[in-house]
């Protein structure tokens, strides 16, 4: 029960996180005009990873895409790459985790396969979350650097009469969305990895032993206990008192030279 809950919760948290990473990547407000010196401005600037926008007091908003690759700062390109890698890994992770969910039955998929898929998706979510957090943090660092640089030469005067005010930018909403979303994806990934440990069947050091009595065949399999989730029946832990009859699970176990005493 706990494993299924952990896995399900990990999936949902990761799903929310990846949706957040996608939203943050698409948002225009990665950096917004710093209003410290002028809290009420008639022209407000903000920038995203893909375009920069200007919102006027009139309500008119004009956005212009960055229609160049070579002309953009390397750091911006790096942030774009990190966010896209995060989204791609997250999307693949979600796809894998859907099939790995314990509550979803797909053919006769082994629990060990589900455990492996859960671990894979968990690792993907962790890397996805780290990519998003790294991307947002790199952008934030870039903003902080530029902020203090522009503060240093905020006003370039012309004879002290004419002032050219340099626009300073501060953290936009997308940064906070990205940090939170990356964190959620990371947490979801960790939860998936924890769930994977509970899903994996424990290996035993000895094989099943069959005892044959006259007239009746009693097959007893010691060990083989899985970490029980409380869902369904544990068919590998059954005594069969039905002369040679086998359960579906036991059809997979073929006798070896050590099976009969």
């Amino acid at each position: 029960m706990a494993v299924t809950a952990c896995q399900g919760l990990g999936f949902v948290v990761s799903l929310i996180g990846i949706a957040g990473i996608i939203a943050a990547t698409c948002m225009d407000q990665w950096s917004t005009q710093d209003l410290y010196n002028n809290p009420v401005t008639a022209v407000f600037n903000y920038q995203g990873l893909w375009r920069s926008c200007v919102r006027e007091s009139s309500g008119f908003t004009e956005c212009r895409g960055y229609f160049t690759l070579l002309g953009l700062p390397a750091m911006l390109q790096a942030v774009r790459a990190l966010m896209i890698v995060g989204i791609v890994l997250g999307a693949i992770g979600l796809l894998v985790s859907i099939f790995a969910l314990k509550c979803i039955r797909i053919g006769s998929m082994e629990d060990s396969a589900k455990a492996n898929m859960t671990l894979t998706s968990g690792i993907m979510f962790i890397v996805s979350g780290l990519c998003a957090i790294a991307g947002v943090s790199v952008f934030a660092n870039m903003l902080v650097t530029n902020f203090w640089m522009s503060t240093a030469n905020m006003y370039t005067g012309m004879g002290g009469m004419v002032q050219t005010v340099q626009t300073r930018y501060t953290f936009g909403a997308a940064l906070f969305v990205g940090w939170v979303a990356g964190g959620l994806t990371l947490i979801g990934g960790v939860m998936m990895c924890i769930a994977c440990r509970g899903l994996a069947p424990e290996e035993t050091n000895y094989k099943a032993v069959s005892y044959h009595a006259s007239g009746h065949s009693v097959a007893y399999k010691p060990g083989g206990f899985k970490a029980s989730t409380g869902f369904g029946s544990n068919t590998k832990n059954k005594k069969i008192y039905d002369g040679g009859a086998r359960t579906e699970d036991e059809v997979q176990s073929y006798p070896s030279k050590h099976d009969y005493v």
């Epitope: 401005t41 008639a42 022209v43 920038q47 004009e62 050219t164």
Partner: antibody, heavy 118, light 113 residues
């Protein structure tokens, strides 16, 4: 077509208040900001403030803050400017104008003359 | 507040001649975000409200004759009337549309010589 129609001329005594209205038609009232501008006879233009009819947000010139109050009634597409504690230097023509892209005022009404005299 | 200074305060030009009005702002009106200059030009005839001519320093309002043109960037701007017509006799104002409070120049009275 877009039209801004203001109320008629007003004569007030010093210390009194005046409320000038500006009725908009021919466009969606809540989609555009309304600005108010003062012009004394034979003189230049002076910005009083603006109101965003959708949310009621207002911005005032420091000179008029505290004395001018801008409001808007969305139901009748009308903007108002109330000027309190009138003095003789408030005698002027008051215009309302619609703000558009470039923060430019594209449509103006004919103006309301306010005379403050004892 | 941004101070707008127009020159000359009055100007007499013959019909068909070119008229040039200058406007200087105490602070740059160039917005780095969209590389637009937030300067607006208005024309006001006696007994009438101002009429929008040019916004963003050089974009002509629809319906405004193409003899009117705006130029300049940062702090120095110019309104040019390429060939003065009788109906162009008016007072012209430049306005800072970049920062609150919006401020106007003192006006330039354009007369016919």
């Amino acid at each position: 077509q877009v039209q801004l129609v203001q109320s008629g001329a007003e004569v007030k005594k010093p210390g009194a208040s005046v409320k000038v209205s500006c009725k908009a038609s021919g466009y969606t009232f809540t989609s555009y900001v309304i600005n108010w501008v003062k012009q004394k006879t034979g003189q230049g233009l002076e910005w009083i403030g603006e109101i965003h009819p959708r949310g009621g947000n207002t911005y005032y010139s420091e000179k008029f803050r505290g004395r001018a109050t801008l409001t808007a009634d969305k139901s009748i597409s009308t903007a108002y400017m109330e000027l309190s504690s009138l003095r003789s230097e408030d005698t002027a023509v008051y215009f309302c104008a619609r703000l558009r892209r470039g923060n430019a005022m594209d449509y103006w009404d004919q103006g309301t003359t306010v005379t403050v005299s004892s | 507040d941004i101070v707008m200074t127009q020159s000359p305060s009055s100007l007499a030009v013959s019909l068909g001649e070119m008229a040039t009005i200058n406007c200087k702002s105490s602070q740059s009106l160039l917005n780095s975000g969209n590389q637009r200059n937030y300067l607006t030009w208005y024309q006001q005839k006696p007994g009438q409200p101002p009429k929008l001519l040019i916004y963003w320093a050089s974009t002509r309002e629809s319906g405004v004759p193409d003899r009117f043109s705006g130029s300049g960037s940062g702090t120095d701007f110019t309104l040019t009337i390429s060939s003065l017509q009788a109906e162009d006799v008016a007072v012209y104002y430049c306005q800072n549309s970049y920062n609150y409070p919006y401020t106007f120049g003192q006006g330039t009275k354009l007369e016919r010589k």
